[in-house]
Amino acid sequence: MGCDRNCGLIAGAVIGAVLAVFGGILMPVGDMLIEKTIKREVVLEEGTTAFKNWVKTGTTVYRQFWIFDVQNPDDVAKNSSKIKVKQRGPYTYRVRYLAKENITQDPEDHTVSFVQPNGAIFEPSLSVGTEDDNFTVLNLAVAAAPHIYQNSFVQVVLNSLIKKSKSSMFQTRSLKELLWGYKDPFLSLVPYPISTTVGVFYPYNDTVDGVYKVFNGKDNISKVAIIESYKGKRNLSYWPSYCDMINGTDAASFPPFVEKSRTLRFFSSDICRSIYAVFGSEIDLKGIPVYRFVLPANAFASPLQNPDNHCFCTEKVISNNCTSYGVLDIGKCKEGKPVYISLPHFLHASPDVSEPIEGLHPNEDEHRTYLDVEPITGFTLQFAKRLQVNILVKPARKIEALKNLKRPYIVPILWLNETGTIGDEKAEMFKTQVTGKIKLLGMVEMALLGIGVVMFVAFMISYCACKSKNGK
């Protein structure tokens, strides 16, 4: 009778020990299984979860625009006053709704190449007005022409054309014209076959970005989605030295198992450069734990503050010998046009940049860029890309429309907020397929370990108690 009880207690302790051991073993084994599954599913090839979402994003992406409406155009042109601006917006477009095209796998170097078609659909319900709303903005062609042709002879010719076309330093244009293009009356007078259509994003619709060639991760998962080449080249040919490198992914995803200590590098064709984001905080996105990576102020610093940025300073005059910060001259990438990129409202820019402009209110929360990355898969489940397009306008003695300017201005034209968030349905699916399974496995591991240990300890205590009782 005593033996039965003792045997039972020992059997219980053994079962507990087995469960605990099994739970303990399941931890590394389970992690290995998860890792194996993740590695298999994030590879960019037909049939994987990643590939399906990569070809055509499951996220609805919106691009909101705020236009800087100039309130005192005549005063600026005549007296070189501060430019008073008032932002108007948002005007919202749906973007990135087209699937990647010309997808070609290269099994030899484990890459996949593609182009990303561009398209934008106006969303009136998410906008403050229509595409026909008018704005007073800098005359893009008049500002750019003397910058491109810094030749005094040609500037005299251009002046004749500007006067003939009744163009001036500022112009009134509709949203649709400003963004997507309009026939410029001054350029239309040039008697050679040149492009006479001007627009901040012209040409956009029916164009493609790429060709991108990215690693598919088949041979090395730590390289998945990393750009191998862009437009057939490993470098951009826009910047000197290492600034010209194409680093990281396109920010839609990153190699899996993202750690907080990691710097996420990505290339953005919008700003013609590679940039990086650093860990900011942990966030719960629709029940999915994500890491919020933010673009640090350091990325926009002057070479004085961040020596790594020295090769992004390609011009000494406007940058005050590379001491100004927060604006990036991307002219080399825009056929020599004087285009400068910054954060909205000149967030993180030096005071000399924003001083000639009135009406700007930079705000970290509204104007910073961030990526919410699910750390196990490396997928970006939510993002907000914010940037501002500015045009440099300088005094030009030979051009009457610009001859009264006493200083150069980096004139804000518009800023945009491109956002995407995983949909509720997709989030549920993601939780079920990824985080849910991982959570469940973790719970099973802990339950087995917990129950096993408790059983083992309880039965062993009972056994020992029983033994001592019998001994008496």
């Epitope: 030749n151 005299v156 010719v157 040039v190």
Partner: antibody, heavy 117, light 107 residues
């Protein structure tokens, strides 16, 4: 086909006047602007005057400033060079030429102006 | 005014020779230089604009190089019809100015 034809050259006494014409076809002079370039016998090319597009500004070489006047009649698609107070050193073949960006892609055949007593 | 100094003022060469003519500007004219060919009794003909851009219809044996103040016209293999006088011209600033010319003669 683009063509420029000069006329009006000839023999003139020092201090005299002459008006050269440059008739253009195949393009509108208004949208390009017209230059006059001269070449003294056995010498090199010398830029003389320019009328910018759309009746824009006029520019002259220092050697002719105040004596020569360039003009254009857009209805006739013709440019003119009015030459007053002519001197012996103004003796040359005068070419009209088309230019937009400052290089001359089309030239006339030239008209000879001789200033001699 | 910007002075354009051409060298040599004349040269003798044979058919098939490679010929180089240089032109120096008295100040930086970027790439705003044109080259012309002129035969006796004829108007000049444009060969090259923007220092390096071959004008349409001009044979590819003609090429231009240079930027800033030093420019070169090269004829890779001289042909009988290439014997003429060549002029450089800056089209950066008014007054537009020409070099004094280089006469290419038969050896």
């Amino acid at each position: 086909e683009v063509q420029l034809v000069e006329s009006g050259g000839g023999l003139v006494q020092p201090g005299g006047s002459l008006r050269l014409s440059c008739a253009a076809s195949g393009f509108t002079i208004d949208s390009f602007g017209i230059h006059w370039v001269r070449q003294a016998p056995g010498k090199g090319l010398e830029w003389v005057a320019w009328i910018a597009p759309y009746g824009g500004e006029t520019y002259y070489a220092d050697s002719v400033k105040g004596r020569f006047t360039i003009s254009a009649d857009t209805s006739k698609n013709t440019a003119y060079l009015q030459m007053n107070s002519l001197r012996a050193e103004d003796t040359a073949v005068y070419y009209c030429a088309r230019s937009f960006f400052g290089y001359f892609d089309y030239w006339g055949q030239g008209t000879l102006v001789t200033v001699s007593s | 005014d910007i002075q354009m100094t051409q060298s040599p003022s004349s040269l003798s060469a044979s058919v098939g020779d490679r010929v180089t003519i240089t032109c120096r500007a008295s100040q930086d004219v970027s790439n705003w230089v044109a080259w012309y060919q002129q035969k006796p009794g004829k108007a000049p003909k444009l060969l090259i604009s923007y220092a390096t851009s071959l004008y349409s219809g001009v044979p590819s044996r003609f090429s231009g190089s240079g930027s800033g103040t030093d420019f070169t016209l090269t004829i890779s293999s001289l042909q009988p019809e290439d014997f003429a006088t060549y002029y450089c011209q800056q089209h950066s600033n008014a007054p537009l100015t020409f070099g004094q010319g280089t006469k290419v003669e038969i050896k």
